[in-house]
Interface confidence: low
């Protein structure tokens, strides 16, 4: 079974996202992975996209994230663009219109992205073998 190119794109984007920290990668997001035993793969992707959308919607123009230097500003802008791309690709992979995100647990964005990367790499290894 050939791996979906969208999956490869997601992994590539996650690699870029986890390579460099920004002022706001330590901010918290809803941890949808904390209790996802009864969740389908598509629901997980949809909920992950929802969490990312909530994050970039709230913090795209957050002055704390934009920082005081040109480099901090550029890195945050790049983070938001990658999150948007990730959102779209996850949304396309999920194929669902909406999904609830009700978990109380929190995780840093950095840890959330690392966890998502692990899941995506596992999925890729299965479909490429």
């Amino acid at each position: 079974h050939k791996c979906d190119i969208t999956l490869q794109e997601i992994i590539k984007t996650l690699n870029s996202l986890t390579e460099q920290k920004t002022l706001c990668t330590e901010l918290t997001v809803t941890d949808i992975f904390a209790a996802s035993k009864n969740t389908t793969e598509k629901e997980t992707f949809c909920r992950a996209a929802t969490v990312l959308r909530q994050f970039y919607s709230h913090h795209e123009k957050d002055t704390r994230c934009l920082g005081a230097t040109a480099q901090q500003f550029h890195r945050h802008k790049q983070l938001i663009r990658f999150l948007k791309r990730l959102d779209r690709n996850l949304w396309g992979l999920a194929g669902l219109n909406s999904c609830p995100v009700k978990e109380a647990n929190q995780s840093t964005l950095e840890n959330f992205l690392e966890r998502l990367k692990t899941i995506m790499r596992e999925k890729y290894s299965k479909c490429s073998s």
């Epitope: 190119i5 969208t6 959308r53 663009r81 948007k84 791309r85 959102d87 779209r88 949304w91 396309g92």
Partner: antibody, heavy 123, light 106 residues
């Protein structure tokens, strides 16, 4: 097959807001994994991407136009719209709506285009 | 913002000639590049996506190559119906079109 049709006034006065609508027929505007964009072309010049709206509802705008642009979708009417505020003569162009994302990636090529509508900014 | 520089801006060639257009990105865009054909008074038409993939229904005389910052679009044997302006477009970060190359028949 899927078709796109732009509509709106052909003449807009300077400092006013340009409003265009793109009606999608032959398919649903909510279809995964497509997205929708606006591109313009001033007379005798090249193509300029204005902005796009995605199934998630998120938007991307050309940084040079971002402060003046709003793109929205009305799924009930199978339409998406462009609003460009504070127009000047430099905004005179043929405005195209287009569908994107029709290949293996979500961010992708604009593969279906409307025929374009000429908008002149003049008093 | 990523800038796309297309060259030449115009060219004139004979029917049957091999025509080559280049597009250079201001930074590495992998293969996130498309090529479009626009005939006078018409909307652009997608010819090549992902730098080298031929869109369904497009004649095989059209081809694309390249990765990173340098890309090439080729018409192996120019036909009268190929008279048009050709544009490259990157989608690595937002979307930017090249300035266009107008192709005419000698």
């Amino acid at each position: 097959q899927l078709q796109l049709q732009e509509s709106g006034p052909g003449l807009v006065k300077p400092s006013e807001t340009l409003s265009l609508t793109c009606t999608v027929s032959g398919g649903s505007i909510s279809s995964i994994p497509y997205y929708w964009g606006w591109i313009r072309q001033p007379p005798g010049k090249g193509l300029e991407w204005i902005g796009s709206i995605y199934p998630s509802g998120s938007t991307d705008y050309n940084p040079s136009l971002k402060s003046r642009v709003t793109i929205s979708v009305d799924t009930s009417k199978n339409q998406f719209s462009l609003k460009l505020s504070s127009v000047t003569a430099a905004d005179t162009a043929v405005y195209y709506c287009a569908r994107g994302g029709a290949r293996d990636r979500i961010d992708h090529a604009f593969d279906i285009w409307g025929q374009g509508t000429m908008v002149t900014v003049s008093s | 913002d990523i800038q796309m520089t297309q060259s030449p801006s115009s060219l004139s060639a004979s029917v049957g000639d091999r025509v080559t257009i280049t597009c250079q990105a201001s930074q590495d865009i992998s293969n996130y590049l498309n090529w479009y054909q626009q005939k006078p008074g018409k909307a652009p038409k997608l010819l090549i996506y992902d730098a080298s993939n031929l869109e369904t229904g497009v004649p095989s005389r059209f081809s694309g190559s390249g990765s990173g910052t340098d890309f090439t679009f080729t018409i192996s044997s120019l036909q009268p119906e190929d008279i048009a302006t050709y544009y490259c477009q990157q989608y690595y970060d937002l979307y930017t079109f090249g300035g266009g190359t107008k192709v005419e028949i000698k």
